[in-house]
C-alpha cells in the first residue's frame, strides 16, 4: 500500500457540500473548514475522514500497489481496501509490501496453513509439532504440497 | 486593545482546586475557540485544553476529569477549573485565542500556579 | 496524539548566522503548523502560520517551510533579540489529536 500524505483542502468547491460543526466537530465524511465555522465534505474517491473530527483537511485515499488488488473503493468515509494478490501476503512486521508465499515447507515438516492474503504457509515439525518460522528454505530441502492436500 | 488577561493564580495545597480567570478585551470571546496552555518552571509549553465557539470542550488526556474550561460571552471571560491539584501541576497558565487554521494568534501574560504543602 | 518532536534542543550561533530548526510530526498535518517564540518571562509569541506564512510584525529574517511531516523554521541572519526559545505546533485536529507542543529549541548567542 503506497502511504498517501494527507491532502491539503483547497477553498471549498461550489459542488461540495457545508454544513455547520456539532460541538466543534464535522462527521465522517468531512473536515472543518479554515474559519471553523463550516464542514466541508471529502471529495468521494480522492479523500476521506472516517471519524467526526476538526481536521482542516480530509485524508488522501490510498492507491493500491501493483501486487495487490482493490477490495473496495475509498468513499469519503472509508479508505481504500487492498489486499495482496494470490500466492503472496503482507506480515504486520512488513506491511509496505506483499512477499511471495513460500512453496512448501522443510524436510520433516508438514504444512498445517495455507498461503492466505495475510499469512504465509504454516509448517510444523512432524514429531513435535513446533511451529517453523524464518526464511523459505533452499528448493532442495522443500517438500512441495499441493494447496488441497491435508496436514497428516 | 485587544488584550488577554489572566488572574486567579497562587499557592494552593496538594488536593485542592483552584479557578483561573482570563478576561478578553478588544474582541468577544463568543465568536473565537480559545485555548489553555501550561508550562512548568524551566519546561515546555503543554497544550491542557480548548473550547469551540459553541462551548464544546476538549482536553489533553491528562487534563480529563481533573481540569475544565468554560467561558462566560456575557462577561467576555473564559474560566479553568483545575480540582485535585498536584505537585507536578505547578506551572505558569496562558490563555490564548485560538484560530482554526492560523494557531494561537493572541496570548495572555500568563498566572502562576504553585501546588506545595 | 500527535507528537511533535523537534531538533536541535539548544543550538549556539553568531550574529548573522542562518539558524534553521526542525520540526517532525508523528503523522501528516499538511501546512498547518505554526511556531513561535518564546522569551524568558514572557507570553509566546507567533511567528509563522500555515506552515510559511508570516504573522504581523515580525522580521522578514523568519521564515517557515515545509509540509506534510517535516517542517523547517530559518533565520536568515541571527540578531541578539532572536535569543529565545522557539515551539512548532500543530494546528489541525486540535479536539481530535490534540495540540502538542515541540519540546521547543533554545537558541544562543555565541
Known amino acids: 500500500i503506497t502511504q498517501q500524505d494527507l491532502a491539503p483542502q483547497q477553498r471549498a468547491a461550489p459542488q461540495q457540500k457545508r454544513s455547520s460543526p456539532s460541538e466543534g466537530l464535522c462527521p465522517p465524511g468531512h473536515h472543518i473548514s479554515e474559519d471553523g465555522r463550516d464542514c466541508i465534505s471529502c471529495k468521494y474517491g480522492q479523500d476521506y475522514s472516517t471519524h467526526w473530527n476538526d481536521l482542516l483537511f480530509c485524508l488522501r485515499c490510498t492507491r493500491c500497489d501493483s501486487g495487490e488488488v482493490e477490495l473496495s473503493p475509498c468513499t469519503t468515509t472509508r479508505n481504500t481496501v487492498c489486499q495482496c494478490e494470490e500466492g503472496t501476503f503482507r506480515e504486520e512486521d512488513s506491511p509496505e509490501m506483499c512477499r511471495k508465499c513460500r512453496t512448501g515447507c522443510p524436510r520433516g515438516m508438514v504444512k498445517v496453513g495455507d498461503c492466505t492474503p495475510w499469512s504465509d504457509i504454516e509448517c510444523v515439525h512432524k514429531e513435535s509439532g513446533t511451529k517453523h518460522s524464518g526464511e523459505a528454505p533452499a528448493v532442495e530441502e522443500t517438500v512441495t504440497s499441493s494447496p488441497g492436500t491435508p496436514a497428516s | 486593545q485587544v488584550q488577554l488577561v489572566e488572574s486567579g493564580g497562587g499557592l494552593v495545597q496538594p488536593g485542592g482546586s483552584l479557578r483561573l480567570s482570563c478576561s478578553a478585551s478588544g474582541f468577544s470571546i463568543s465568536r473565537y475557540a480559545m485555548i489553555w496552555v501550561r508550562q512548568a518552571p524551566g519546561k515546555g509549553l503543554e497544550y491542557v485544553g480548548f473550547?469551540?465557539?459553541?462551548?464544546?470542550?476538549y482536553y489533553a488526556s491528562w487534563a480529563k476529569g481533573r481540569f475544565t474550561i468554560s467561558r462566560d460571552n456575557s462577561k467576555n471571560t473564559l474560566y479553568l477549573q483545575m480540582n485535585s491539584l498536584r505537585a507536578e501541576d505547578t506551572a505558569v497558565y496562558y490563555c490564548?485565542?485560538?484560530?482554526?487554521?492560523?494557531?494561537?494568534?493572541?496570548w495572555g501574560q500568563g498566572t502562576l500556579v504553585t501546588v506545595s504543602s | 496524539d500527535i507528537q511533535m518532536t523537534q531538533s536541535p534542543s539548544t543550538l549556539s550561533a553568531s550574529v548573522g548566522d542562518r539558524v534553521t530548526i526542525t520540526c517532525r510530526a508523528s503523522q501528516s498535518i499538511s501546512t498547518y503548523l505554526s511556531w513561535y517564540q518564546q522569551k524568558p518571562g514572557k507570553a509566546p509569541k507567533r511567528l509563522i502560520y500555515?506552515?510559511?506564512s508570516l504573522a504581523s510584525g515580525v522580521p522578514s529574517r523568519f521564515s517557515g517551510s515545509g509540509s506534510g511531516t517535516e517542517f523547517t523554521l530559518t533565520i536568515s541572519s541571527l540578531q541578539p533579540d532572536d535569543a529565545a526559545t522557539y515551539y512548532c505546533q500543530p494546528n489541525s485536529g486540535i479536539a481530535t489529536y490534540g495540540a502538542a507542543f515541540g519540546g521547543g529549541t533554545k537558541v544562543e548567542i555565541k
Open positions: 490564548a485565542r485560538y484560530t482554526y487554521s492560523d494557531g494561537t494568534d493572541l
Open positions: 500555515k506552515a510559511s
Open positions: 473550547i469551540t465557539s459553541d462551548s464544546s470542550a
